[in-house]
C-alpha cells in the first residue's frame, strides 16, 4: 500500500485552476504569477469496506497547507468545505471518514470527484470563472464536474 | 436525543440461532458505524464485528467469522445480529454501539442496554 | 490475536488522581492503536470517554484524560467525585479489529 501522500495538480476543461482565496477553493483562469494549488491525494486504506465500481476512494487535501476537502449538510444542503486536518490522520484512521472521502473515478482524461457521504454530489465549478467550488447533483449542466488531474512525481 | 434501543432477552438451546435487533434514534445511522460487543457472565468485553450502514459492509472479529451475521435496515434505522450454532459459552450480554467520528477521531459514545442471550439446554 | 489487560479492580480518594492502564500482549501500545475508553456506572448504559488515545468526547468532564504510559494507553482521573465510581473499559484497535480489555473497577472510597 502506498502510505504517503501523492501530489497532483488540477484544472478543469476550460483551463481553470484551483487558487486558495482566503480559506477557500477558487477555479480560476491560469495566469503569469499565479499561485495554483497542489492537491495533495492518498487512497482509502480502508477500501474493501466501500462501495466497489464507484471509484477509487481517495482523501483529497492542499498539499503543504494542512487543509482537506470535506463535505457536511448545512441545513439540507451538501456543501464543499476547507477543513484544517492533516491527511495522514485521516488515511490512519480505522475506519473510512466518509465525509472527507471521493470516488475518484476516471475516464480517458478526466476525472470526477464524489462525495462518499453525500452518494451523487460531485465536487463541481460554476462555468462562470472565479467562483467557489462546490458539490452539485446537476452534471454536466451550469457546472463543470470534469477535471484533469496531472499527478506530480 | 441519541438511543439505541435492543430487543428482549433470548433463551436459546445449543445449536440453534438468535437474532438480536439495535433500534437508533436521534441519528442518522448512514452517518456512523454500528458495532455488536458482548459481556459474558464476570468477564470483559468482547469486540464481536461492525457494519456501515450506510453501504452494509461489515467487518468481524476472525473468532467470530462465520457465526455472526451484522445486517441492517436502513428505513427503519435497525441493526441485527444474528448469531448462529449457538454453544453455552456464547451465554452473554450482548451490546451495539456507535462508533461515530467527531472533531478528529472515532469514539464508542452511543451504546445500547444489552440484550441478555442464554444458551442452556 | 492481541489480549488486552486491565488492572481488575483500582481505588481512590475522593478529591485524589488515579490513572488506570490498558496493555497490549502484542507489544506497545501507541497512537495507532486509536485507544478508546467507555464507561459503565451501576444502572446506567455505558458511555464513551475518551476516543483516538487522548480526545475526550464530547460533554466528558476535564478531569479525565487519556495518554499512551510507558508503552501502555492510559485514562488518568484528577480529582476523583463519587459520581465516578464504574467500570472502565479499554478498546485497542489492530488493523482490521477491536480488542476490548478486561475493564477495570474503580471504587470512589
Known amino acids: 500500500k502506498i502510505d504517503t501522500p501523492q501530489r497532483g495538480s488540477i484544472q478543469d476543461i476550460n483551463h481553470r485552476v484551483w487558487v486558495l482565496q482566503d480559506q477557500t477553493l477558487i477555479a480560476v483562469p491560469r495566469k503569469d504569477r499565479m499561485s495554483p494549488v497542489t492537491i495533495a491525494l492518498i487512497s482509502c486504506r480502508h477500501v474493501e469496506t466501500l462501495e466497489k465500481d464507484r471509484g477509487n476512494p481517495i482523501y483529497l487535501g492542499l498539499n503543504g497547507l494542512n487543509l482537506c476537502l470535506m463535505c457536511a449538510k448545512v441545513g439540507d444542503q451538501p456543501t464543499l468545505q476547507l477543513k484544517e486536518k492533516d491527511i495522514m490522520d485521516l488515511y490512519n484512521q480505522p475506519e473510512p471518514v466518509k465525509s472527507f472521502l471521493f470516488y475518484h473515478s476516471q475516464s480517458g482524461r478526466n476525472s470526477t470527484f464524489e462525495s462518499v457521504a453525500f452518494p451523487g454530489w460531485f465536487i463541481a465549478v460554476s462555468s462562470e470563472g472565479g467562483c467557489p467550488l462546490i458539490l452539485t447533483q446537476e452534471l454536466g449542466k451550469a457546472n463543470t464536474t470534469d477535471f484533469g488531474l496531472t499527478m506530480l512525481f | 436525543q441519541v438511543q439505541l434501543v435492543q430487543s428482549g432477552a433470548e433463551v436459546k438451546k445449543p445449536g440453534a440461532s438468535v437474532k438480536v435487533s439495535c433500534k437508533a434514534s436521534?441519528?442518522?445511522?448512514?452517518?456512523?458505524?454500528i458495532h455488536w460487543v458482548r459481556q459474558a457472565p464476570g468477564q470483559g468485553l468482547e469486540w464481536i464485528g461492525r457494519?456501515?450502514?450506510?453501504?452494509?459492509?461489515?467487518r468481524y472479529d476472525p473468532k467470530f467469522q462465520g457465526r455472526a451475521t451484522i445486517t441492517t435496515d436502513t428505513s427503519t434505522s435497525t441493526v441485527y445480529l444474528e448469531f448462529s450454532s449457538l454453544r453455552s459459552e456464547d451465554t452473554a450480554v450482548y451490546y451495539c454501539?456507535?462508533?461515530?467520528?467527531?472533531?478528529?477521531?472515532?469514539?464508542?459514545?452511543?451504546w445500547g442496554q444489552g440484550t441478555l442471550v442464554t444458551v442452556s439446554s | 490475536q492481541a489480549v488486552v489487560t486491565q488492572e481488575p479492580s483500582l481505588t481512590v480518594s475522593p478529591g485524589g488522581t488515579v490513572t488506570l492502564t490498558c496493555r497490549s500482549s502484542?507489544?506497545?501500545?501507541?497512537?495507532?492503536?486509536?485507544a478508546n475508553w467507555v464507561q459503565e456506572k451501576p444502572g446506567q448504559l455505558f458511555a464513551g470517554l475518551i476516543g483516538?488515545?487522548?480526545d475526550r468526547a464530547p460533554g466528558v468532564p476535564a478531569r479525565f484524560s487519556g495518554s499512551l504510559l510507558g508503552g501502555k494507553a492510559a485514562l488518568t482521573l484528577s480529582g476523583a467525585q463519587p459520581e465516578d465510581e464504574a467500570d472502565y473499559f479499554c478498546?485497542?484497535?489492530?488493523?482490521?479489529?477491536?480488542?476490548f480489555g478486561g475493564g477495570t473497577k474503580l471504587t470512589v472510597l
Open positions: 502484542s507489544g506497545a501500545v501507541t497512537t495507532s492503536n486509536y
Open positions: 483516538g488515545t487522548n
Open positions: 454501539a456507535r462508533l461515530h467520528y467527531f472533531g478528529n477521531n472515532f469514539f464508542f459514545d452511543y
Open positions: 436521534g441519528f442518522n445511522i448512514k452517518d456512523t458505524y
Open positions: 457494519i456501515d450502514p450506510a453501504i452494509g459492509t461489515t
Open positions: 478498546a485497542l484497535w489492530f488493523s482490521n479489529h477491536w480488542v
